[in-house]
């Protein structure tokens, strides 16, 4: 008897972080033997949607014409072949931005920082939130969470970086969200450009979790160091 069918691949275009009102297409790619594709959404009745395969039958398209809160969440897909249903795909987390007003991102003491010194990125919201995310453009692992403990809500979070190296330079944005859905984020803050000077010979900071050996410098997760702020927020890596 043959082993289980290989799991399909699930992805979203143009990406998995979508602004409210924009369109998104979810793709599920299986094998040429696929007869039907099924998309399941966590905490929704299954199946969430079914589609016939597109020629040459190795994938299916699930369209979301206008992103809203209802579509944000965690998805998996399956395909059916003559021998049965496949294993589930790895999950796809579809995140909607624009659920809350944009936070403000500031650099303390300045966005111009000398290599080896310290800088703190400060993300501040108008309303009390329990999760703050710092995102660096063009990073493969861009999400750094500060999440409040015990359900306490905060108006700000500090992301300290010390010592700063060339890797920290770049464009940052922050988001805020509520604990009841980590798939709903605020509008992004205005971008903040962190410029690191005197950093040509800086050593690369060593990440505290493993990443693909094929990863280049921009694929490393951002690694602020220093104590967790006094605000009752806890640091999480995504």
């Amino acid at each position: 008897q043959a082993g289980p069918l290989p799991k399909p691949t699930l992805w979203a275009e143009p990406g998995s972080v979508i602004s409210w009102g924009n369109s998104v297409t979810i793709w599920c790619q299986g094998t040429l033997e696929a007869r039907e594709y099924r998309l399941d959404k966590e905490e929704s009745p299954a199946p969430w949607d079914r589609q016939n395969p597109l020629e040459p039958k190795n994938k299916a398209r699930f369209s979301i014409p206008s992103m809203t809160e209802d579509y944000a969440g965690r998805y998996r897909c399956y395909y059916r072949s003559p021998v049965g249903w496949s294993q589930p795909s790895d999950p796809l987390e579809l995140v909607m931005t624009g659920a809350y007003s944009k936070p403000t991102l500031s650099a303390l003491p300045s966005p111009l920082v000398t290599s080896g010194k310290s800088v703190t990125l400060l993300c501040q919201s108008r309303s009390p939130m329990d999760t703050f995310l710092l995102i660096k453009e063009r990073a493969a692992h861009p999400l750094l969470h500060l999440r409040s403990e015990h359900g306490a809500q905060q108006h700000q979070a500090e992301f300290p970086m010390s010592p700063v190296t060339s890797v920290h330079g770049g464009t940052y944005r922050c988001f805020s969200s509520h604990g009841f859905s980590h798939y709903l984020l605020s509008h992004p803050s205005d971008p903040l450009e962190l410029i690191v000077s005197g950093s040509l010979e800086d050593p690369r900071p060593s990440p505290t979790r493993s990443v693909s050996t094929a990863a280049g410098p921009e694929d490393q997760p951002l690694m602020p160091t220093g104590s967790v702020p006094h605000s009752g927020l806890r640091r999480h890596w995504e």
């Epitope: 007003s101 936070p103 500031s106 650099a107 303390l108 501040q124 919201s125 108006h155 006094h230």
Partner: antibody
Framework: QVQLQQSGAELMKPGASVKISCKAT????????IEWVKQRPGHGLEWIGE????????HFNENFKDKATFTADTSSNAAYMQLSSLTSEDSAVYYC???????????WGQGTTLTVSS | DIQMTQSPSSLSVSLGGKVTITCKAS??????IGWYQRKPGKGPRLLIH???TLQSGIPSRFSGSGSGRDYSLSISNLEPEDIATYYC?????????FGGGTKLEIK
């Protein structure tokens, strides 16, 4: 606990300048905006502007742009507001206030009474 | 600028009773409103923010509600220490603005 201690009452002559201080304790001074608010009898509370001590960024109410200057010293956890070219219209109680993120104003100083009189 | 119209400007109250103070914004402020209590010789004290979130240490007899342009602060079971002047603050806009105040007096 969070406290904002303001400098004492001032009696100034028209045309002079005055610098009001606000000493903060009980929290990380550099990461919270300090707001300045004016209260004149019959005029209610009026927002003058704000400073983020950690980087010196400021925002102003247009009505006070040429009147007020904000500074902060993170080594002593103190914020300052200087008012220039004083007139009788500047006679008021001035408050420094900590702001929660970009949200509400939470902790207020006790107020500094400024009287401008010849 | 967003104008905040607070009413009434003064109110005679009975201890043990309930009062409601209202603030009307000149435009939608998305629930970004705080309520403050001020006593003579002291700085104002934050009671409620984000329309209905009670600030730590504030008794539950204070409550806030509202949406869009219309907001209110209610105080039930009035106690002697509640006699003060109350203000609303909108912080939806880069230029925060206050209501004109409501002075509570004992009947």
């Amino acid at each position: 606990q969070v406290q904002l201690q303001q400098s004492g009452a001032e009696l100034m002559k028209p045309g002079a300048s005055v610098k009001i201080s606000c000493k903060a304790t009980g929290y990380t001074f550099r990461t919270y905006w300090i707001e300045w608010v004016k209260q004149r009898p019959g005029h209610g509370l009026e927002w003058i502007g704000e400073i983020l001590p950690g980087n010196g960024n400021t925002h102003f109410n247009e009505n006070f742009k040429d009147k007020a200057t904000f500074t902060a010293d993170t080594s002593s956890n103190a914020a300052y507001m200087q008012l220039s070219s004083l007139t009788s219209e500047d006679s008021a109680v001035y408050y420094c206030v900590r702001r929660l993120g970009r949200g509400p104003f939470d902790f207020w100083g006790q107020g500094t009474t400024l009287t401008v009189s010849s | 600028d967003i104008q905040m119209t607070q009413s009434p400007s003064s109110l005679s109250v009975s201890l043990g009773g309930k009062v409601t103070i209202t603030c009307k914004a000149s435009q939608d402020i998305n629930e970004y409103i705080g309520w403050y209590q001020r006593k003579p010789g002291k700085g104002p004290r934050l009671l409620i923010h984000y329309t209905s979130t009670l600030q730590s240490g504030i008794p539950s007899r204070f409550s806030g509600s509202g949406s869009g342009r219309d907001y209110s602060l209610s105080i039930s079971n009035l106690e002697p220490e509640d006699i003060a002047t109350y203000y609303c603050l909108q912080y939806a806009n880069p230029l925060p603005t206050f209501g004109g105040g409501t002075k509570l007096e004992i009947k």
